[in-house]
Interface confidence: medium
């Protein structure tokens, strides 16, 4: 590992369409790939009127958005689905929405999806 | 170097049946996701068949599913399409690609492909 | 299933040119979208995955943006090795769809 890196060797895995999608339900997920590729994690989720619905968990390929990122935080304001990336095992088991443009409190507090 | 060759290919009369197999190189096997991918002679790209990096979860395309199997033996490093009841709409290139997770990353690799022709 | 639905379907193009290529996806599919490109009787080749990420040895022309329904490959200046069908991927649910290609030709 690199010093003061973060390496990805697992990831919480969710997926909501897990039934068509043939997978498990929740569990920890693996995370492969190219020795000279970065790995990390991500979650999806949506706020429908105040209540989180996870829509996915699992293992993301190099990017470079979610390098050196080990909280899993979305940025973007006002999105229809939440995605955010990170680096360091399970660093998805909790994520939040900060959106850049607003310097006030976060519109929602960190979440810890429950099995 | 990472590779994938097909094989198995070939001519084949409707209602017939065919196995086809990607052999493996250059990773390692065990961990990925692998895939089957058609492309009939002048279209475009229609996946398959999909498995996961041992074997407990297949998924197929609707236009295959009950007639093609997947399978893996990664004690060898093979990938396998197992094709009954050949329709002339299955003749295509046939492509297998690795992935890295089961679902939701990139086809990064592919095969050659191997040519099926259902025909009589 | 997602329905992914490239456009154009060709384009005639001259070495050096800015080339863009888009794809619209039947429901949001986030960052799950990836590009290939596939030469006559060769195999397709991922270029662009994740939406952005460019894959490996593939140069910095190439480039992709977009999230929810849609995405766009941009070619920044056309090189002769860059005349090719390009397909876009959803991955965001099996089963895996593709677009229809579209077919980079020379004018």
């Known amino acids: 590992a690199i010093l003061g890196r973060s390496e990805t060797q697992e990831c919480l895995f969710f997926n909501a369409n897990w039934e068509r999608d043939r997978t498990n339900q929740t569990g920890v997920e693996p995370c492969y790939g190219d020795k000279d590729k970065r790995r990390h994690c991500f979650a999806t989720w949506k706020n429908i009127s105040g209540s989180i619905e996870i829509v996915k968990q699992g293992c993301w390929l190099d990017d470079i958005n979610c390098y050196d990122r080990t909280d899993c935080i979305e940025k973007k304001d006002s999105p229809e689905v939440y995605f955010c990336c990170c680096e360091g095992n399970m660093c998805n088991e909790k994520f939040s929405y900060f959106p850049e443009m607003e310097v006030t409190q976060p519109t929602s507090n960190p979440v810890t999806p429950k099995p | 170097e990472v590779q994938l060759l097909e094989s198995g290919g070939g001519l084949v009369q409707p209602g017939g049946s065919l196995r086809l197999s990607c052999a493996a190189s250059?990773?390692?096997?065990?961990?990925?996701?692998m895939n089957w991918v058609r492309q009939a002679p002048g279209k475009g790209l229609e996946w398959v068949a999909g498995?996961?990096?041992?074997?407990?979860?297949?998924s197929y395309a609707d236009s295959v599913k009950g007639r093609f199997t997947i399978s893996r033996d990664n004690s060898k490093n093979t990938l396998y399409l197992q094709m009954n009841s050949l329709r002339a709409e299955d003749t295509a290139v046939y492509y297998c690609?690795?992935?890295?997770?089961?679902?939701?990353?990139?086809?990064?690799?592919w095969g050659q492909g191997t040519l099926v022709t259902v025909s009589s | 299933d997602i329905q992914m639905t490239q456009s154009p379907s060709s384009l005639s193009a001259s070495v050096g040119d800015r080339v863009t290529i888009t794809c619209r996806a039947s429901?949001?599919?986030?960052?799950?979208v990836n590009w290939y490109q596939q030469k006559p009787g060769k195999a397709p080749k991922l270029v662009i995955y994740?939406?952005?990420s460019r894959a490996s040895g593939v140069p910095s022309r190439f480039s992709g943006s977009g999230s929810g329904t849609d995405f766009t490959l941009t070619i920044s200046s056309l090189q002769p090795e860059d005349f090719a069908t390009y397909y876009c991927?959803?991955?965001?649910?099996?089963?895996?769809?593709f677009g229809g290609g579209t077919k980079v030709e020379i004018k």
């Open positions: 429901q949001s599919i986030l960052s799950f």
């Open positions: 991927q959803q991955s965001y649910n099996l089963p895996l769809t």
């Open positions: 994740a939406a952005t």
């Open positions: 690609a690795r992935s890295a997770n089961w679902h939701d990353t990139a086809l990064d690799y």
């Open positions: 250059g990773f390692t096997f065990s961990s990925y996701s």
């Open positions: 498995i996961n990096y041992n074997g407990g979860y297949t």
